[in-house]
């Protein structure tokens, strides 16, 4: 079970974009081409932004997450990649408290980026109301940031 106390809740994002740091037995069964990853990210980006904007507008007064400089990208020269397995449990956890239909679309896209043999982390919501809102906000903010980092890297790398 991942802890949601303090910064530990962001453990998910340490693996967010680092396919290249994972051992070979965790690699996806079908390695996606950069063009495929870019296409998925371009589909995810407006959904992620929309969810974040909706949530911020509804939850006025929540502080901005100060965990913006996460090691989202691999420093390796290979293709940076979103680890769908690491992120999926978080979106599954927040679905009942968010826009069901948009989350479903995000889950479908993340599933394409899933590492087949990697066990999924178990994620539960913080019980405290304020903590829970912060948790959802942080997931949405960090996911949006992660997508931007990967897209930037893909665009600047070899096409």
């Amino acid at each position: 079970m991942l802890s949601h106390a303090g910064p530990a809740r962001f453990a998910l994002f340490l693996l967010c974009c680092m396919e290249t740091l994972l051992p070979s037995h965790m690699a996806p069964t079908h390695r996606l081409q950069p063009s495929d990853v870019r296409k998925i990210i371009l589909e995810l980006r407006p959904m992620s932004k929309g969810l974040l904007q909706d949530y911020v507008s509804k939850e006025i007064g929540l502080p901005e997450s100060n965990h913006s400089s996460l090691p989202c990208l691999s420093s390796d020269s290979q293709l940076p990649h979103i680890n769908g397995s690491a992120i999926l449990p978080y979106f599954r956890a927040i679905r009942p408290l968010s826009d069901k239909n948009t989350i479903d679309k995000i889950i479908e896209q993340l599933d394409k980026l899933k590492f087949q043999r990697e066990p999924e982390a178990e994620v539960s919501m913080p019980a405290d109301n304020f903590e829970r809102k912060n948790f959802i906000l942080a997931v949405l903010q960090q996911f949006s940031a992660c997508l931007e980092h990967v897209l930037q890297s893909l665009n600047s790398g070899p096409q």
Epitope: F91, R95, P96, L97, K100, D104, E108, D111
Partner: antibody
Framework: QVLLVQSGAEVKKPGASVKIFCKAS????????INWLRQAPEQGLEWMGW????????KYNETFKGRLTLTADTSTNTVYMELSSLRSADTAMYYC??????????????WGQGALVTVSS | EIQMTQSPSSLSASPGDRVTITCRAS??????????MHWYQQKPGKVPKLLIY???NLESGVPSRFSGSGSGTDFTLTISSLEPEDAATYYC?????????FGQGT
């Protein structure tokens, strides 16, 4: 698009068992609960239980405990509902329906077409 | 288990009418700041269809004349301007606690 396709109608004798399937497509099968419900003729909806295909976890309505078994086959994206010791009161339309993705139960947004089970001697 | 009571049990109305159906739960269905109350429509001989989820969210593809409100134990489904195709049975359902339970239908 999301589709839940159920097996056809069944006629069973009292005391027998029935096994119905629900084949899912168009979404990531292992991340969503599948609920089973039934509706007797001219009656309301009754929830029977759910299964989470990702780990095979189940929860049954006490009304059906001991008679109901839910199983999932992730290789074929199919969920099975088996009801044993059938009686005439079990005559109903049986539905599968997709639920939520977490321990927090959610609405059932996609439904199978239903499978009519008739129990008669 | 949470008991769900709908009222009225049946009603007759004309096209263009504003229709309200209420649902009362025997205990609160709120959790995490959200009401886990949902509304379904079932036309004769057809499969139930999700209309409103979590008290007030309109399901994708459902006409905007349908709306839901309420929290805690008391909930309402409103059809702002009735259409002939709205003739159906409407069910409320809670998902806050197992067993999941439905109202008897309107």
């Amino acid at each position: 698009q999301v589709l839940l396709v159920q097996s056809g109608a069944e006629v069973k004798k009292p005391g027998a068992s029935v096994k119905i399937f629900c084949k899912a497509s168009g979404y990531s099968f292992t991340y969503y609960d599948i609920n089973w419900l039934r509706q007797a003729p001219e009656q309301g909806l009754e929830w029977m239980g759910w299964i989470f295909p990702g780990d095979g976890g189940t929860k049954y309505n006490e009304t059906f405990k001991g008679r109901l078994t839910l199983t999932a086959d992730t290789s074929t994206n199919t969920v099975y509902m088996e009801l044993s010791s059938l009686r005439s009161a079990d005559t109903a339309m049986y539905y599968c329906a997709r639920g939520g993705t977490s321990v927090i139960r959610d609405a059932m947004d996609y439904w199978g077409q239903g499978a009519l089970v008739t129990v008669s001697s | 288990e949470i008991q769900m009571t709908q009222s009225p049990s049946s009603l007759s109305a004309s096209p263009g009418d504003r229709v309200t159906i209420t649902c009362r739960a025997s205990e609160s269905v709120d959790n995490y700041g959200i009401s886990f109350m949902h509304w379904y429509q079932q036309k004769p001989g057809k499969v139930p269809k999700l209309l409103i989820y979590r008290a007030s969210n309109l399901e994708s593809g459902v006409p905007s004349r349908f709306s839901g409100s309420g929290s805690g134990t008391d909930f309402t489904l409103t059809i702002s301007s009735l259409e002939p195709e709205d003739a159906a049975t409407y069910y409320c359902q809670q998902s806050n606690k197992d067993p999941l339970t439905f109202g008897q239908g309107t």
